[in-house]
Amino acid sequence: AGVFELQIHSFGPGPGPGAPRSPCSARGPCRLFFRVCLKPGLSEEAAESPCALGAALSARGPVYTEQPEAPAPDLPLPNGLLQVPFRDAWPGTFSLIIETWREELGDQIGGPAWSLLARVTRRRRLAAGGPWARDIQRAGAWELRFSYRARCELPAVGTACTRLCRPRSAPSRCGPGLRPCAPLEDECEAPPVCRAGCSLEHGFCEQPGECRCLEGWTGPLCMVPVSTSSCLGLRGPSSTTTGCLVPGPGPCDGNPCANGGSCSETPGSFECTCPRGFYGLRCEVSGVTCADGPCFNGGLCVGGADPDSAYICHCPPGFQGSNCEKRVDRCSLQPCRNGGLCLDLGHALRCRCRAGFAGPRCEHDLDDCAGRACANGGTCVEGGGAHRCSCALGFGGRNCRERADPCAARPCAHGGRCYAHFSGLVCACAPGYMGARCEFPVHPDGVSALPAAPPGLRPGDPQRAGVIAVIVVVVIAIVAGIVVLVISRKKRMAKYEKAEIKEMGEMHRELNA
């Protein structure tokens, strides 16, 4: 038994152009948290196996808000170690999966939203009881720096935590450098001494004299990075400074294949051969299985028919994404009809209906012809189980509640200015024109004869008296109609207002819960 410990040192944009400035989306601040998954073995099958050695989730980090114009810093991280206890022997070789998750804290109604920002998968060798191993990994445009170690918990000891150690009654009998320990016996033994000079950081030993290198390191003392230990197989002109061949540019330079995929060049492009459990153009899709618990927010995980096929998360209402990590903006589907206000309460949707409408989606129009639903002098026309309003001049919309803009079509000719009135419109004509729509040019001798009269209503205009009469009659009719409509509407709406008040009270309780 023992504990695997992971310490995240930094997470931030990687070097080079195109690095992201912020982990947060445009919707506002966010914070990070990490998930670690451990799988035994270094075999290619490891990708499909569950987190058999265990998994852990970090606390949420401090809230991060991007500062405009400021350089993108390393992001604030959660405090403390991620610890993954293991019950059985430490395997020595294992796969380490670290996921960086983003929790968005913007104006999401009903709580934060989660999304997977980066995932690194690395196969490693590590002896329990050894020193911290440091690592730097890139995941897309992000860079993650971390350290990890495995340590045994007494009475287990050794590089695999398989030997049991129990204190002697007289431990002083053990000499310097020896400890009271043995497989189920009381005797002293020395811990294995690695090869002299073996790197504390990149090497370890399970037997005396060994210097076994962690992945990526080589040499008798594990001091040489694998990438620099050989210059074979590279293309291009020879370098006089190192004696190595310097590679020319090629589609596989920098190895675009993720997760241990191998790159092979094709004409003008590249092809990745992925290890089992990874797929995609760049092997970027991980063969995580349901055993890894990949579905968030109560999503139901269903495994594929064969080991190579991916899991599927069936998300509960309100969540979407391959891991159910995204909260659905269900209001974006505009479920509330007739101008109703949509509220996503997380477990349910509510529509706040405009006056005159009701129902779960505001689909019921309370104004039918029986209730004289057409406002502003409009007349109700029934038909086909519905109704429509034939609106009076100057009004429009479903119930004639919207003031129509008769000037929208620019009816006044020759630069005349349009004014909307209850009766329709009036044109104020430019100098030199007259008529209801300023369509008639004025004779030159009449231009200065009537300067004081309002434009468009000139003394010589034969329509003047008719227009004034029409306006007076229409205004009187409209005022009378409005009075009748208001009285009848007050009676009819009283009962619905009670229901509205009751519904709003329920909604407030749900939002506060």
Partner: antibody
Framework: QVQLQQSGTELMKPGASVKLSCKAT????????IEWVKQRPGHGLEWIGE????????QYNEKFKGKATFTADPSSNTAYMQLSSLTTEDSAIYYC????????????WGQGTTLTVSS | DVQITQSPSYLAASPGETITINCRAS??????LAWYQEKPGKTNKLLIY???TLHSGIPSRFSGSGSGTDFTLTISSLEPEDFAIYYC?????????FGGGTKLELK
């Protein structure tokens, strides 16, 4: 004290094989690498490879793969190097040495075995 | 492979003098270079390891310096028993390689 005692001079025919020995005393044999080094006049010292007796782990110089084979017998504290398909190029002094317990180098050497390959 | 160039190949000096022998690696080997002394009829002797660490039992007139690619063995105030062949060896990466040797002769 630590000592590495090597087998005596060998005179071999081309095409034959020979097994050189290196007996260790004065320390725990299994915990230190035994190194093998070739010395020819005008060629200086050449590292052939190494073996960790406790585990049998070996490392070879690519140049000597197929030529040299290392084994170790912890019961007799003896390391062996077998050289196969001998040619006159294999004529040399062969040394065994110990990689130190606390010293990052060869802290003890054998006296050397002279191999002569001649028809 | 890491090539080790040792110079000079021959060096004549007198007792009491100070001499230096150089080894240059074809690429960085950090500090992992050792110096050995070879004398007829005796087993090879480790003098310096990790570039500059004096092995136990070796007189303090022997000293080593350098890291990366350039290393130096200095013997100050030569004694008669110091006339021998000296080799350097890198043990940073496989295959381990030796310098060509320097024969220190009595002038």
């Amino acid at each position: 004290q630590v000592q590495l005692q090597q087998s005596g001079t060998e005179l071999m025919k081309p095409g034959a094989s020979v097994k050189l020995s290196c007996k260790a005393t004065g320390y725990t044999f299994t915990g230190n690498w035994i190194e093998w080094v070739k010395q020819r006049p005008g060629h200086g010292l050449e590292w052939i490879g190494e073996i960790l007796p406790g585990t049998g782990s070996t490392q070879y110089n690519e140049k000597f793969k197929g030529k040299a084979t290392f084994t170790a017998d912890p019961s007799s504290n003896t390391a062996y190097m077998q050289l196969s398909s001998l040619t006159t190029e294999d004529s040399a002094i062969y040394y065994c040495a110990r990689w130190g317990s606390t010293v990052v180098a060869y802290d003890y050497w054998g006296q050397g075995t002279t191999l002569t390959v001649s028809s | 492979d890491v090539q080790i160039t040792q110079s000079p190949s021959y060096l004549a000096a007198s007792p009491g003098e100070t001499i230096t022998i150089n080894c240059r690696a074809s690429k960085s080997i950090s500090k992992y270079l050792a110096w050995y002394q070879e004398k007829p009829g005796k087993t090879n002797k480790l003098l310096i390891y990790s570039g500059s660490t004096l092995h136990s039992g070796i007189p303090s007139r022997f000293s080593g310096s350098g890291s990366g690619t350039d290393f130096t063995l200095t013997i100050s105030s030569l004694e008669p028993e110091d006339f021998a062949i000296y080799y350097c060896q890198q043990h940073n990466e496989y295959p381990l390689t030796f310098g060509g040797g320097t024969k220190l002769e009595l002038k």
